[in-house]
């Protein structure tokens, strides 16, 4: 779905970290920890040497609710985005890199330590490059892994 | 197999509300989208709202969100549908119909239908 | 709300005929858009989804296409049972919105 700019399952875990509140994670994984601005996830994925991953994504879209479930409801998904600094939005940032081929929902962009935009780790449509569907979750695994493992081959 | 059994016939007199069931089968129940669509006498197809029966998160018609309230018991895997202050225009058949298996919005299986009739 | 115009509102053709129905959307849609066929006194079935995918025990001889806002659905050659009401729905926003219809009858 386009969008123009617009203002802004629970993981079975023994973890012991307090629940966030639902108004970070957005139900995007209410146990994981969600960075609040752009701004703070591209400071801490600097600074941790963590990749980044960012989900643009509209309350009112029901692409965007459909692709929150199953990435909620999928543990591995989950497991792994612990070691992404994370951010969900649901208004556009002013960095045009974040929206390499258009403002649609949802979509899921990766950013290097660097602060390099990986526009090479794409979804499967030539014409929303970035965007995912719930059948898409095996693509977008694999594509966390290979965020993360280029991460470490840069090192 | 995939089955959406849904409950039979009602008739209502105006400003009542009615309570149509939609009990599923075949599938893991709280990971699709449950749709509610309508279809009155000799016209289109109409749709209503969803429902993620995993969690309870709907999203309605803005036509219907007054009056609809869109309900899932987990234990039952059964999902509802409730109208109220029913009108003669609300006469029709509703239909529940799944989301994709893998959690799409896309409409895949249908209820046959449970004809609401509304009259004084 | 989107608003979805089939046409033609009644195709008038033979069994062997090649059908072809149309959908067309106010506005981009991508390629959220389904088929499907209805028969008097039954439930709607899925035919097709995301504007090309065919529904499993589907036949082939049904399909799909079109992106943005122009969309068909083509039956390659009508078999009797084909004789129906068609629809298409847009599932790119909320709310869903179907087509008028389109009603494949005995020429």
């Known amino acids: 779905r386009d969008t123009t700019v617009k203002p802004g399952a629970k993981k079975d875990t023994k973890d012991s970290r307090p629940k966030l509140p639902q108004t970070l994670s957005r139900g995007w994984g209410d146990q994981l920890i969600w960075t609040q601005t752009y701004e703070e996830a591209l400071y801490k994925s600097k600074t941790s040497n963590k990749p980044l991953m960012i989900i643009h994504h509209l309350d009112e879209c029901p692409h965007s609710q459909a692709l929150k479930k199953v990435f909620a409801e999928n543990k591995e998904i989950q497991k792994l985005a612990e070691q992404f600094v994370l951010l969900n939005l649901v208004y556009e940032t002013t960095d045009k890199h974040l929206s390499p081929d258009g403002q649609y929902v949802p979509r899921i962009l990766f950013v290097d330590p660097s602060l390099t935009v990986r526009a090479d780790i794409t979804g499967r449509y030539s014409n929303r490059l970035y965007a995912y569907e719930p059948a898409d979750t095996a693509l977008l695994l694999d594509n966390m892994k290979k965020a993360l493992k280029l991460l470490k081959t840069e090192l | 197999q995939v089955q959406l059994v849904q409950s039979g016939a009602e008739v209502k007199k105006p400003g009542a509300s009615v309570k149509v069931s939609c009990k599923t089968s075949g599938y893991v129940f709280s990971r699709s989208w449950m749709n509610w669509v309508r279809q009155a006498p000799g016209q289109g197809l109409e749709w209503i709202g969803w429902i993620y029966p995993g969690d309870g998160d709907t999203n309605y018609n803005g036509k219907f969100k007054d009056r609809v309230t869109l309900t899932a018991d987990k234990s039952t895997s059964t999902v509802y549908m409730e109208l109220s202050s029913l009108r003669s225009e609300d006469t029709a058949v509703y239909f529940c119909?799944?989301?994709?298996?893998?959690?799409?919005?896309?409409?895949?299986?249908w209820g046959q239908g449970t004809l609401v009739t509304v009259s004084s | 709300e989107i608003v979805l115009t089939q046409s033609p509102a009644t195709l008038s053709l033979s069994p062997g005929e090649r059908a072809t129905l149309s959908c067309k959307a106010s506005?981009?849609?991508?390629?959220?858009l389904s088929w499907f066929q209805q028969k008097p006194g039954q439930a709607p079935r899925t035919l097709i989804y995301r504007a090309n995918r065919l529904v499993d025990g589907i036949p082939a001889r049904f399909s799909g296409s079109g992106s943005g806002q122009d969309f068909t659905l083509t039956i390659s050659s009508l078999e009797p049972e084909d004789f129906a009401v068609y629809y298409c729905?847009?599932?790119?926003?909320?709310?869903?919105?179907f087509g008028g219809g389109t009603k494949v009858e005995i020429k």
């Open positions: 506005q981009d849609i991508n390629s959220y």
């Open positions: 729905l847009q599932y790119d926003e909320f709310p869903f919105t």
């Open positions: 119909a799944r989301g994709g298996y893998d959690g799409s919005p896309w409409l895949s299986y």
